[in-house]
């Protein structure tokens, strides 16, 4: 029951996280730009991974896409790639985890298969979350190191006016959405990996032996069941009885882990 709950919760947390990563990737508010000494009028700029927007004090808002690839910083391209990889891995992970859910029956899928799928999706969620966190962190670092407080001296033409302008870049809402979403996806992935351990069937250290006595002359050799501890002289499941006792491998019968002879 605890395993099902852990798996289900992991799935839901990862689902919310991946939805958040998609939202953050599509959002325009990755960074905002303010002019300290704006000499013209009240205009607010904000930028995303795909386009730049302007919002005026009147409420008018307009966005323009980055139509050039060559003019964009390599860091921005890297952030785009990380976020997309995170989304793709997360989406595949969700797909795999749906089939891995213990509460969903698909044909005669064994617990071991579900355990493997749960582990796979868990790892995918972990990598997806890490990609998102890395992408957002790289962008934040880019803002801090390259743009944070850029004081620029502008010259226009020969003998033109010089204007010192301070442009302040601040973290946009998308960065915080990305960090939280990446964290949730990561937590969901860890929960799936934990659930995988509970789903995996416990492997016994011995193979049950079935006895088929062929006559009254069967010689009983003491210590024949020492293998049950996993440490005796018979850990390799050798034939102990000549009178028809065979290991299960030889008999070709495959009982479940709950069938004991």
């Amino acid at each position: 029951m605890a395993v099902t709950a852990c798996q289900g919760l992991g799935f839901v947390v990862s689902l919310i996280g991946i939805a958040g990563i998609i939202a953050a990737t599509c959002m325009d508010q990755w960074s905002t730009q303010d002019l300290y000494n704006n000499p013209v009028t009240a205009v607010f700029n904000y930028q995303g991974l795909w386009r730049s927007c302007v919002r005026e004090s009147s409420g008018f808002t307009e966005c323009r896409g980055y139509f050039t690839l060559l003019g964009l910083p390599a860091m921005l391209q890297a952030v785009r790639a990380l976020m997309i990889v995170g989304i793709v891995l997360g989406a595949i992970g969700l797909l795999v985890s749906i089939f891995a859910l213990k509460c969903i029956r698909i044909g005669s899928m064994e617990d071991s298969a579900k355990a493997n799928m749960t582990l796979t999706s868990g790892i995918m969620f972990i990598v997806s979350g890490l990609c998102a966190i890395a992408g957002v962190s790289v962008f934040a670092n880019m803002l801090v190191t390259n743009f944070w407080m850029s004081t620029a001296n502008m010259y226009t033409g020969m003998g033109g006016m010089v204007q010192t302008v301070q442009t302040r870049y601040t973290f946009g809402a998308a960065l915080f959405v990305g960090w939280v979403a990446g964290g949730l996806t990561l937590i969901g992935g860890v929960m799936m990996c934990i659930a995988c351990r509970g789903l995996a069937p416990e492997e016994t250290n011995y193979k049950a032996v079935s006895y088929h006595a062929s006559g009254h002359s069967v010689a009983y050799k003491p210590g024949g069941f020492k293998a049950s501890t996993g440490f005796g002289s018979n850990t390799k499941n050798k034939k102990i009885y000549d009178g028809g006792a065979r290991t299960e491998d030889e008999v070709q019968s495959y009982p479940s882990k709950h069938d004991y002879v």
Epitope: Q33, L35, N38, P39, V40, T41, V43, N45, Q47, S52, V54, E56, S57, S58, G59, F60, T61, E62, R64, Y66, T68, L70, G71, L72, P73, L76, F147, S150, A152, M154, T156, Q163, V165, T167
Partner: nanobody, 122 residues
Amino acid sequence: QVQLVESGGGLVQPGGSLRLSCAASGSIFSINAMGWYRQAPGKQRELVAAITFGGGSTNYADSVKGRFTISRDNSKNTLYLQMNSLRAEDTAVYYCNADLLVGGFPRRNVYWGQGTLVTVSS
């Protein structure tokens, strides 16, 4: 590199009209707003009029309201100032100012033109 080139200044009689223009060129991603400032001899530079390029919101100095009209042509990245009923106190160097986003992943900067002289005298 971004350039702002003003034109249209000159000598005009009181009550006359002039039309100033300012063309922005270079690696401009988009224009937030543009405006006209003026600086009379021995005085501080002051805002005359400003306009946002997206919504077209305008802002005028009290001294020019009803006489001056600011406009823009988005397709040409050009700013205009129509000056009517000019007075002697309007004599000054008129500077074009632009709040721009520049570059591929745009940075916001403010640029100034070199200025054009407007003289109102009889």
